[in-house]
Each structure stands twice: as C-alpha cells, then as structure tokens.
C-alpha cells in the first residue's frame, strides 16, 4: 500500500452474518473522495461508495483479496488487502438493561435484559459480566460472570443479587457487558462495551432511618447496618458495644457486625446517635430449627393421635419469629399446625391429629420452620401398636361372694378391635401385694368388667388397676386405689385349744386362741364349748368374744372337749381336745437356754405320737395353773423354735413338751430355761460362822431365782488383808498380788473354810455369784482373826 493510499483495513461483526469493514482514508483527501471496493476469490465483486466503511455478507472460509481504489480530485490510489475470517473481530452490540428493580426488605437487586439472540444465527455461548457499584463515587462491590446460550431468538435474562448492605443505605449502580463464544468462528472474540448504567436509590422521608429493620439472622453471620440521616451521626452501638462508623454518601453511615452473637429473646438493639437524637433497629440472631428429636406418636383412645417431640437446640427466636411446626400425614394428605408464641427450653411439644376411619398405619412428617430455615423428622407408626391408655376412671368394686368380687372401670376410647392386658394390684393390710394379669377384649363404649376370685373372706383389700394393649407399648397410669372388705364366710377352722386342770384338780380350764383373720372369715361373735363322754354331752352357755377361756367341773373320767367359733355366717368345724392326761413317771427337769429372741426345743421322733405335739410355757415365778402360751406342732416334727414378744432376758420360764396319742396328752419333757441369761443382780448373803487364829468359816444363802437371772454356775470368793475405813487398797482393786480367789463350781456348796491365815489380822472377804450371763455384784465383809494362843 502506497503512502497516501487507503490503509488499516479492519473488519468486525456483531452477528457473524455481516462484516463491517472500515479503513483509514489516504492523507490529504477531502470530503469528495469516492471509493471502489473489489472483493475477489473465485469471482470478483465491486462496490462504489463515498465512505470509508462497507458492510459485506460474511465471507466463507479462505483468503480474499480486497482492492480499495480511492478516487479524488488530485488523482487516485489503490490498496490491496488479504482478508480472512481470522482477521475479523466478533464484538457483540452494547447490551441494554431493560429493568433494574429492588426488594428493599431483602436487600435484593433484580436485573432484567434481552440477549437479542434473534440477530445471531448460530447457537453460541455467551458470557455476561455484571458489575454492581455503590455510592456516588461508584465503588465496585460486585463483579460477576453469568453464562447463557444464544438460541436464535430474543431471550430475557434475569439475575438477582442480595446485597450485604441494605439497599436503602446508598445508591447502587448496575452495568453489564457480554462476550460471545462461538465454536465455528475462527476470528477474534472481544467484549462488548458496557451497557448504559442503571441505578437504584431509596428516597428517604423526613425521618432518619436505620436499616435493616427487625432482621432475623443466623448466629455467627456478618451483617451491615446503616443510618440514613440528614444529621451528623456521632456513634453506633450494638447492644452496649460501640462500633466503628463506615461513611457513605452525605451524612449516611454504616457499621459492619461480624460473627454476631445470639440475641436476647426480645432481640438486640442497634442504635445510631446524633447530637440530639437516637435511632434504632432490632436484630434477632438465632438458629434455624433443629431436627425435632424423639418424635413419638401414640394414642390414648384410638380416636386422636398425640405426636410429641423435643425441639432440640433452642433457636433463641420467640413470638412471631418462633418455630412453627406442621405435622403432615402422607397417606391421607391431612396436616395440623402448631405455632408457638414462646419457645420453652426443654419442654416437649405436642400436636393432636384426629384418627382417620379404617386407617391404622400413619406416615407422619413433622416439618419445623422459622425465618432462618426448616428441618423435619419422620415416623411410620401402626397406631394400634402405640396405645398408651388413659388412666382407668370410675373404678368400682362389687361383691360376688365372700371370695370373689367384680371390678369395673371406665377407659375412654374406641378399642373394639384390640385386646387389653390389665394388671390388677391386690394389697392386703400387713401382707405382700399380689399382681394379677387379665386379658380383656376392647370395647367401643369404654366400660370394662372383670371378676376376681381366690380372695379371702372378710378381708380388707386395696385394689388398683392399670392397662396396656396386648401388643404392649405403655402401661396406663394406675387408677385410684379402691378399698373393699370382702363379705364374711363361716370360720374355716376351729380355734387352737388347750386345757389345764385347776390347782385343786376339780375343774378343767379350757383355753383357746382367737382365730387368725384368714381362718375367722369374719368377726367372731361367740364360742360354743361342749364336753362329751361315752354317756353324755354337756354344752356350756355361749361364750361371747373376746373371752377365750372356759372352766368345767369334771371328774377324772375321759372327756372330749369341743370348741366351736361362730360369726354372722356360721360356725367353724369343732376343735377337739381330750381331758385325759397320760402319766409319765420318768421325767427329769432339764435346763435350756435360748438364742436371744427365742428358744430352740428338740426331741426324738416318736411314732406313737399320732395327733400333734404341744409346747406350753409359763413364767416360773407365776402360781399354778402355769400357762402363758402354747404352740402346737405337727406329729412328724422333732424341733421347734418358741418365740414370743413377752419373753424377756433374765427371766426364768418353764417349758413343757406334750405328745398326743389317742386324743390324750402325755407330758414328755419338762424344762426350765432362759431366752437369754444375764448376770445375777444381787450378791449372795454370807456370814462368818467361825474364826480362829489361822482360819475363817464362811456360810452363805441361796440367791432367789428371780434375782439370779440365769442358771447359777458358781461363786467367786476373794480374800486378802485389808482394814475397813483405811486408805489400804480394797480386795478387788487391780494390781494386788496378795489377793486370793476361790472359784466354787459346786453350786450345792454353801460353806467355805479359809485356812493358813495370820493371827490377829484384818481380812477383807468378798463373795460374788455368776451365771453364763456374767458375774453378779459383790458382797464384802471385814473379819479379824484371833490372836495366836
């Protein structure tokens, strides 16, 4: 290209269909220059024009020769160029924003533009660059790329962006440009120019405002607050903590809070102050709902399902921001809602869901939702297996007979299709409680009835009941307790009887014990005592309770005494005892000692004893007839422990073992004994019978049985030199080596001569008795031996 010829040919396209080629005019040419442009490949096309650019249809692949001939006043000049697609630049048209809008409540910008895809024949990828600028000074806050595809028709595109700063705080600008990436184009691809800028600003009213208002935010997030003000803002605080100010346009300021802490239930104040005023907003920093924990669905009545759960971590959001729960049942599509005004910390929440006819399996989803998010828990239940019955009410007890009652109660709910397992607690006073389980068919009308047998007559029972379904889930709570006295029945046994002859031997005294409540079967009103021999039967008049003794004048013939107990229903079987006593000449009195609480008596088995054995006992010091109590034991026994609340340590008791054969009793053993031996409570009385120059004779008396308090095992006699009313040591004081002790184990011995003494010397004598329970107190005396002759 000659100097002064057209130069710098440059071709661009915005749609790959038309190339816009332009060149620079030769220097010195004026307005009136004409150009002839010829394009040559296989054929040649020429164009006449008066400007330095030409639009030509896009050329197919290959090199083209372009000849530009410039014709001007002072001659012509020609330039030749080789043109190829690779030399062409693809520069999209400057895009235009159709609409920029804002949602101030969420600080979100919404952008809308047209890609003008209809002017572009080929499917192409487009990269858009979107720029957000803030403040009048147009500080860049966001630069983002956005990918779309051109598909031969005009398409609207949308983009939104949530600002970290409330949009009210400052003016926001947006501009866009694009870049087309076409696989079939071998030329240069370049960015379009930036679109004309669009902006969003908030028109403040007369009042200073703080933004955002009432914002709910996740704990740990960052947030920006601003104050749009006509006055100069002096300070900003979150809670009572000062924050550095970020200056915006005019008097507007912002603060940035990083890693925000959880708020109080009423929120946290963010405050901006001016010289004369204070302006605020409240921030609620909390958590999204935790996954509901321990979701459990059950029913009390097969009418209503109660789903309960624990909310888990506290959200710190209450009132209108609290978590709302929706329980959805997926098979039926039905749902119920719970909106909590306050959020208690550890409390379990619950929702009620009405059961649906003919539906047993329920698939529940519990959705939790608050302004910060949502969560859910699911549970699949066969509700007939999740019955937690109500507490049984109207619990009543009615008599059937003396050993059976009818229990009735109310259990609300429609249980026609299931069975109940009910546990009845039966408690007798001073007795172990008994549990009985019954299976009952569920009913529609909520009233239940069960018979309870194998009870004792005339017994005060306390009943209560609880129920569960047969496919156990949970027991109901226990019903109220119901006390009930069963009706009376005839006494089931005759009284335990014994007899003693009076001290003069003329009267037979009959004793009997009150029947235990489980044998009396009612309140015993009286006793009938009769006496029969081979010739006759004699009845005494009726003896009212609580008299348990009768006296009959009898000769020494054989009689059978019969005692019958009567209550309001009837009489007991008779208790029979023979008056005859079989003599036993071979009796020795034995000694027995107990074990603190009772006394163990043993004997040899005797096949002749066909009815039973009787052990009777009494206090030795009591006068005849000696009877304190008796105990009957079966004929096959060889031992028994006698215990009684009346037994006292140190008291001597007489024990008699009787064996029964042919309805007559024979005394087999006679024993005296103690439940527990104690030491004697008195010392033996002793006197000096004789003294000589070298000996003393001492004599003592028996200690009365009552004061012995055990079996006498011996005496301890101490003697040593000593004088009355001197400071010389007493006999029993420790450390004396000259004291002598005699242990007298022959308890029949009542005298003792002490020899080898010194003449005309004072001796201190001490006597003590002892049992296996210990040594008794001392009795002492001072004696002076005679002078040696």
């Amino acid at each position: 290209q000659k100097k002064g010829a057209p130069h710098d040919l440059k071709c661009v396209t915005n749609n790959l269909q038309v190339w816009n080629c332009s060149w620079k005019a030769p220097s010195g040419t004026g307005r009136g220059t004409d150009y002839e442009v010829c394009i040559e490949n296989r054929s040649r096309s020429c164009y006449q024009l008066e400007k330095t650019s030409i639009k030509i249809p896009a050329l197919s692949h290959g090199d083209y020769e372009i000849t530009i001939n410039s014709l001007h006043d002072f001659g012509s000049s020609t330039s030749k160029f080789t043109l190829n697609e690779q030399n062409v630049s693809l520069i999209p048209d400057t895009p235009e924003i159709l609409n920029l809008s804002a949602d101030f409540s969420t600080s979100t910008l919404y952008l809308k533009w047209n890609d003008r895809g209809s002017v572009f024949p080929h499917r192409s990828n487009v990269i858009w660059e979107i720029k957000v600028l803030r403040k009048e000074s147009m500080e860049l806050v966001k630069l983002v790329t956005h990918n779309t595809t051109l598909n031969g028709k005009d398409t609207l595109h949308h983009w939104s962006w949530a600002s970290d700063m409330p949009l009210e705080c400052a003016i926001h600008f947006v501009e866009i440009r694009c870049y087309i990436d076409n696989l079939h184009f071998s030329g240069l691809e370049e960015w379009s120019d930036w679109s004309p800028v669009k902006n969003i600003s908030w028109i403040p009213d007369s009042q200073t405002k703080v933004f955002p208002q009432d914002k709910v935010i996740l704990v740990g997030s960052d947030i920006t607050f601003c104050c749009v003000s006509q006055e100069k803002v002096l300070s900003a605080l979150i809670g009572h903590t000062n924050c550095p100010l970020i200056h915006l346009d005019g008097e507007n300021v912002a603060i940035k809070i990083r890693n925000i802490s959880v708020s109080a239930s009423s929120g946290t104040n963010v405050v901006f102050t001016t010289e004369d005023n204070i302006f605020g907003t409240v921030i609620f920093a909390g958590y999204p709902p935790d996954t509901p924990q321990q979701l459990n669905c059950e029913t009390h009545d097969l009418k209503e399902i109660i789903c309960s759960w624990n909310p888990g971590r506290v959200t710190a959001l209450v009132g209108p921001r609290a978590t709302s729960y929706t329980l959805v049942e997926s098979f039926s599509g039905k749902y119920v809602r719970l909106k909590r005004a306050e959020a208690p910390t550890n409390e379990s929440y619950q929702l009620l869901f009405q059961m649906l006819p003919n539906q047993e399996i329920y698939n529940f989803t519990l959705n939790a939702h608050n302004p910060l998010g949502r969560s859910q828990s699911t549970i699949l239940v066969n509700i007939t297996e999740k019955v937690y019955p109500h507490t049984p009410t109207s619990f009543k007890v009615k008599d059937i007979n003396s050993t059976a009652v009818k229990l009735s109660w109310h259990l609300p709910g429609n249980f026609a299709k299931i069975n109940f397992l009910c546990e009845i607690e039966i408690k007798k006073s001073n007795s172990v409680q008994e549990q009985r389980n019954v299976t009952i068919k569920g009913v529609e009308n909520s009233s239940y009835l069960v018979a309870l047998d194998k009870l004792n007559p005339y017994t005060l029972y306390t009943f209560r009941i609880r129920c569960s379904t047969e496919t156990f889930w949970k027991w109901s709570k226990w019903s109220n307790k119901k006390q009930h006295l069963t009706t009376e029945a005839s006494p089931s046994k005759g009284p335990d009887t014994w007899r003693e002859w009076s001290s003069d031997g003329k009267n037979l005294i009959i004793y009997w014990k009150p029947l235990p409540i489980n044998e009396a079967n009612g309140k015993i009103l009286s006793y009938n005592v009769s006496c029969s021999s081979d010739e006759e039967t004699q009845s005494l008049s009726e003896i009212p309770d609580p008299q348990h003794k009768a006296e009959i004048r009898l000769d020494k013939n054989d009689y059978i005494i019969s005692v019958v107990a009567k209550n309001s229903v009837g009489s007991s079987p008779p208790s029979k005892i023979a008056s005859m006593e079989i003599p036993n000449d071979d009796l020795k009195i034995e000694q027995v000692v107990g074990m603190g609480k009772g006394i163990l008596l043993t004997w040899h088995y005797d096949p002749n004893m066909t009815c039973d054995y009787v052990i009777k006992w009494c206090n030795s010091s009591r006068s005849e007839p000696c009877l304190m109590d008796w105990r009957k034991v079966p004929s096959n026994s060889t031992e028994t422990v006698i215990e009684s609340d009346e037994f006292r340590p140190g008291i001597r008791y007489n024990f008699f073992l009787y064996g029964c054969r042919n309805q007559g009793y024979q005394l087999l053993r006679s024993m005296i004994g103690y439940i527990e031996e104690l030491a004697p409570i008195v010392a033996p009385n002793f006197t000096v019978e004789d003294t000589s120059a070298d000996s003393i004779l001492v004599k003592w008396e028996d200690i009365p049985v009552e004061e012995l308090r055990g079996f006498l095992r011996g005496y301890l006699f101490y003697f040593g030199k000593g004088e009355r009313d001197t400071s010389k040591m007493r006999v029993l004081e420790s450390g004396r080596s000259d004291i002598k002790v005699k242990n007298i184990t022959d308890i029949s011995q009542k005298t003792l001569r002490i020899a080898d003494l010194q003449g005309k010397t004072s001796y201190h004598l001490v006597l003590r008795a002892y049992t296996d329970g210990g040594v008794g107190p001392e009795k002492s005396m001072y004696v002076v031996t005679k002078e040696n002759s």
Epitope: Q207, L237, G239, N277, G280
Partner: antibody, heavy 125, light 108 residues
Framework: QVQLVESGGGVVQPGRSLRLSCAAS????????MHWVRQAPGKGLEWVAV????????YYADSVKGRFTISRDNSKNTLYLQMNSLRAEDTAVYYC??????????????????WGQGTLVTVSS | EIVLTQSPGTLSLSPGERATLSCRAS???????LAWYQQKPGQAPRLLIY???SRATGIPDRFSGSGSGTDFTLTISRLEPEDFAVYYC?????????FGPGTKVDIK
C-alpha cells in the same frame, strides 16, 4: 422488688428552677437506661428525656431542650431532672421510668417498665 | 418525629365484651419498638405489651397485641371490671419517643 420513688415536686413560679429526684431500688441501677415522662393534668403522656445506663448520652424532647437537664448518680442509685426557666405549660405529674430490659442484655432503646408513682410539679405565679 | 394516632378516643363496652384498640403511626415503626400501656386514674402507667405482641410479666392472656408497619392493635378478648382504663401506645425506636393520645375504655 423493683421500685422507683420520685420526689422534689411542688409549686414554683414561672422562670424559676426545680430539681426532681428518683430513688431506685431492687435492681442494678447502673445497667439500665432511665427516662422522665410527664403528664399534664387531664392530658396524655409526653416523653421528656432519657439518660443512658452510664450517663454518657442524654436526649430530650424539643419542648424542654436547653431548659431541662437529666443526670444520674449510679453510686446513689438516683436519677435527677434539673428544670430551669419553668413555664406554665411544664405543669404536670412527672414520672421516672426504667428501661424494660438491661442495656447489658438488649442494648439501648427499650419499653418503659416499671414506672414511679409520680410527683406533681405546678408552675404558677 | 413519629406521630401516633389512637382510635377510637373512647370505647364504651360492657364487661365480658371484646375490645379492639387501634394505633396508627405517621411513618413505619418497627414492630420491635411498639408498646402498649394501661393507666388508671391516679396511678402510674403500667406496661402491657412490648415488641408489638409480647405480653409483659404478670399480664393476663386476655391482652394481646398485633400489627406491623404503621398499623397496630391491642385486643382485650373479654373485658374484666378492672380493665376499664386509658390505654396508650408508644414507639421507642427513635427519639423523641412518642405516645399516642390514648383510648379510654369505659363501662357502657
């Protein structure tokens, strides 16, 4: 229990001064913002002034700005209102009121709870 | 300043009836900054509701608050004899803190 007791009210001539006190008990006085609110006879409530928990910031209603001064003595648990250049329209029952929430918990700007029983100021010649 | 208007000025009702009191703001007020007070003759005001809907300690649940923006409501579901009094709304979100002129609830 939380208690606020106002004192210092009375009859005063226009142009003169008066100082009201409010004795606080039953709470940590130094953690709460405090307010004065007044009520003219037969009229509604009008906020007068606020002082921050630490006494550093004070704000006033336009009607009293430049004439009234709010102050506090945290060591004595007492709030004050110094009223100068009194006018007839200042005649009212003056209540002191506490912020409903501690500044340490929620920050500043809170509802008013509790209120004192009030003290009557009469400005008359 | 934010001006609060209350309506009606007077509400004449019988015990057991429902009372609905309205409070309107001259510009938007954060619901976190709206309170309701009750005042009986010769007594200091008593806080009922704060944060537009949160009941103060010891306030019976027949009192409830609602609303946002510029419109707020205090509802007394069932008037008791002790509820006849003057009720004030208040905004405390920006100074000057302002009260409404009050609604008097009296016995019909």
């Amino acid at each position: 229990q939380v208690q606020l007791v106002e004192s210092g009210g009375g009859v005063v001539q226009p142009g003169r001064s008066l100082r009201l006190s409010c004795a606080a008990s039953g709470f940590t006085f130094s953690s709460y913002g405090m307010h004065w609110v007044r009520q003219a006879p037969g009229k509604g409530l009008e906020w007068v002034a606020v002082i921050w928990y630490d006494g550093n910031n004070k704000y006033y209603a336009d009607s009293v700005k430049g004439r009234f001064t709010i102050s506090r003595d945290n060591s004595k648990n007492t709030l004050y209102l110094q009223m100068n250049s009194l006018r007839a329209e200042d005649t009212a029952v003056y209540y002191c009121a506490r912020d409903g929430e501690s500044s340490m918990v929620r920050g500043l700007l809170n509802w008013f709870d509790p209120w004192g029983q009030g003290t009557l100021v009469t400005v008359s010649s | 300043e934010i001006v609060l208007t209350q309506s009606p000025g007077t509400l004449s009702l019988s015990p057991g009836e429902r009372a609905t009191l309205s409070c309107r703001a001259s510009q938007s007020v954060s619901s976190s900054y709206l309170a309701w007070y009750q005042q009986k003759p010769g007594q200091a005001p008593r806080l009922l509701i704060y944060g537009a809907s949160s009941r103060a300690t010891g306030i019976p649940d027949r009192f409830s608050g609602s609303g946002s923006g510029t419109d707020f409501t205090l509802t007394i579901s069932r008037l008791e004899p002790e509820d006849f009094a003057v009720y004030y709304c208040q905004q405390y979100g920006s100074s000057p803190f302002t009260f409404g002129p009050g609604t008097k609830v009296d016995i019909k």
